[in-house]
């Protein structure tokens, strides 16, 4: 008679995850009687994954039945396969024996789990940066097989250049991540903008995964602050605001000294936001001009964010002479301030970081 | 090891009916058909029948076809044979035996259950 | 049915001597390059036990002074050299349709 073989047809198999995956065997002849067993891998520590005697394989099912007459297909269904189901499985003949002996096995068939990658998230720095800073944000995907993977960075939809990324572990594995970093430069007009990160995978058909972060989250637009002052009015009034602008996000308390002393403290809530998606906003303070002697240095300071406190000085000059009504000459402004205006004088405080 | 344990002796009168049992164990009960075969005293082997457990497909001697019926429990792994309308001449030892090659054959074999049929 | 025809119906054999025992089916018992043909020894008082199946492949544990030959419709089963605990009752059965046994050869030691 001729000697028996096992005959693995196919090399590999590749399966997605939750499928079933077929592995198949046949033997050449019914002699010698004995039966099959299916192991992955080889040598001492190989696994059982099928006895066609003994034993409880309840995700095992045989293609043939295996009572058929004169049964040589010894091919099995693997059912709901997962990435950890991967690797190189072997059909042994065994003979008949106490105990069974091991004949011959098949040449194997290599089982590869197609599984998709997570959804990919994308986290960005833990604190705030300013305009013209590069901030750093990761994308991250999980459990995907085979390794090749293709990921790309969008910024509003222009796709980046400046990032690294690792795909681990760097040998064999029954599923694999993805971690890719991009360095980003903020812009003040970044508020609205946004960060994509774009996997590609053959699991996933054409249609990329992909995952996204705000860069709200991560920019912090300081304000310009601007004073502006009316008339004297009829009752020795002036009114004179500080305008905060363009500044992001909204958390900000301001708050107005007269000549050191705190005057009054504000909190910003619930302001309008501009097309940019920054905010602005005026406070106003009446100063009684007739209540001071001397000259009232007016302050306006303001804490953006939880940032050291940016300071704008305004000197108003009280006149000796008695005024006509709604004439410009009983709080006289001297001085220039940066922006090359007359109408008061403007000093910056040391702590005034920002740039106009 | 396989093995097969078989159900105790019976004495049964003409026209009665008899339940022999098979106890399986060593193996998956489910992959292996289980045949039953007689042998009245001094003389030779007689086919009855054999069962699928996995689907309790049978095959009968046509002999027995209308007086033996076959069943399985597979969650004892145990099989059943029951023979009705005893005669004398059944009077037999009757074995289990499974076959592990499904090629129709006997390769493991129960120790016998002796079946007396007298008035 | 195929009815399997041993002979003879009885066998004595010296010890060390060659013992043969013929079956002979009423059709052929081949099919797809196999003869479905098995040799089993029934002791006194014991259940039968395989020796030959497939009408030439010896079951493990079957000392190898056993051997099975033959295709078609006859065959032999062969005891090279007689022991003493080979005496038994030896019987063929076939199963190319459903399964029937022969008749029993007793083999006895002269």
């Known amino acids: 008679e001729e000697e028996l073989q096992v005959i693995q047809p196919e090399k590999s198999v590749s399966v997605a995850a939750g499928e079933s995956a077929t592995l198949n065997c046949t033997a050449t002849s019914l002699i010698p009687v004995g039966p099959i067993q299916w192991f992955r891998g080889v040598g001492p520590g190989r696994e059982l994954i099928y006895h066609q005697k003994e034993g409880h394989f309840p995700r095992v099912t045989p293609v043939s039945d295996p009572t058929k007459r004169n049964n040589m297909d010894f091919s099995i269904r693997i059912s709901n396969i997962t990435p950890a189901d991967a690797g190189t499985y072997y059909c042994v003949k065994f003979r008949k024996g106490s105990p069974d002996v091991e004949l011959k096995s098949g040449a194997g068939t290599e089982l590869s789990v197609r599984a998709k990658p997570s959804a990919p998230v994308v986290s960005g720095p833990a604190v705030r940066a300013t305009a013209e800073h590069t901030v750093s944000f990761t994308c991250e995907s999980h459990g995907f097989s085979p390794r090749d993977i293709t990921l790309k960075w969008f910024k509003n939809g222009n796709e980046l250049s400046d990032f690294q990324t690792n795909v681990d572990p760097a040998g064999k594995s029954v599923s694999y991540s993805i971690r890719s970093t991009a360095r980003v430069v903020l812009t003040r007009r970044d508020v609205h903008s946004q960060v994509i990160c774009e996997v590609a995978h053959v699991t996933l058909q054409g249609d990329p995964l992909r995952g996204t972060a705000n860069l709200s989250e991560a920019i912090r637009v300081p304000p310009f602050l601007e004073f502006t002052q009316q008339s004297m009015r009829a009752d020795n009034q002036v009114n004179v605001t500080c305008q905060v602008m363009k500044f992001y996000p909204q958390r900000l308390q301001l708050t107005w000294l007269e000549n050191g002393n705190v005057s009054r403290t504000e909190m910003a809530s619930a302001l309008p936001e501009n097309k940019d998606g920054t905010y602005n906003w005026t406070s106003w303070l009446l100063v009684n001009v007739s209540a001071h002697r001397d000259d009232v240095k007016l302050t306006c300071q303001v804490e953006h964010d939880g940032q050291p406190a940016v300071n704008k000085s305004f000197s108003v000059k009280v006149s000796a002479h008695p005024k006509e009504q709604g004439s410009n000459t009983a709080a006289e402004n001297t001085g220039t301030n940066e922006r090359g205006s007359s109408d008061y004088k403007d000093d910056d405080d040391k702590h005034h970081h920002h740039h106009h | 090891q396989v093995q097969l344990v078989q159900s105790g002796a019976e004495v049964k009168k003409p026209g009665a009916s008899v339940k022999v049992s098979c106890k399986a164990s060593?193996?998956?009960?489910?992959?292996?058909?289980i045949n039953w075969v007689r042998q009245a005293p001094g003389q030779g082997l007689e086919w009855i029948a054999m069962?699928?457990?996995?689907?309790?497909?049978?095959h009968y001697n046509q002999i027995f076809k209308d007086r033996a019926t076959l069943t399985t429990d597979t969650s004892t792994s145990t099989a059943y044979m029951e023979l009705r309308s005893l005669r004398s001449d059944d009077t037999a030892v009757y074995y289990c035996?499974?076959?592990?090659?499904?090629?129709?054959?006997?390769?493991?074999w129960g120790r016998g259950t002796l079946v007396t049929v007298s008035s | 049915d195929i009815v399997l025809t041993q002979s003879p119906d009885s066998l004595a054999v010296s010890l060390g001597e060659r013992a043969t025992i013929n079956c002979r089916a009423s059709?052929?018992?081949?099919?797809?390059?196999?003869?479905?043909i098995f040799w089993y020894q029934q002791k006194p008082g014991q259940p039968p036990k395989l020796l030959i199946y497939?009408?030439?492949n010896l079951d493990p544990g079957v000392p190898d002074r056993f051997s099975g030959s033959g295709s078609g419709t006859d065959f032999t089963l062969t005891i090279s050299s007689l022991q003493a605990e080979d005496v038994a009752v030896y019987y063929c059965?076939?199963?190319?349709?459903?399964?029937?046994f022969g008749q029993g050869t007793k083999l006895e030691i002269k």
């Open positions: 035996a499974m076959d592990y090659g499904s090629l129709y054959a006997m390769d493991y």
């Open positions: 060593g193996y998956t009960f489910t992959n292996y058909w």
């Open positions: 069962i699928d457990p996995s689907d309790s497909e049978t």
């Open positions: 059709k052929s018992v081949s099919s797809s390059g196999y003869n479905y």
């Open positions: 497939l009408a030439s």
């Open positions: 059965q076939h199963s190319r349709e459903l399964p029937t």
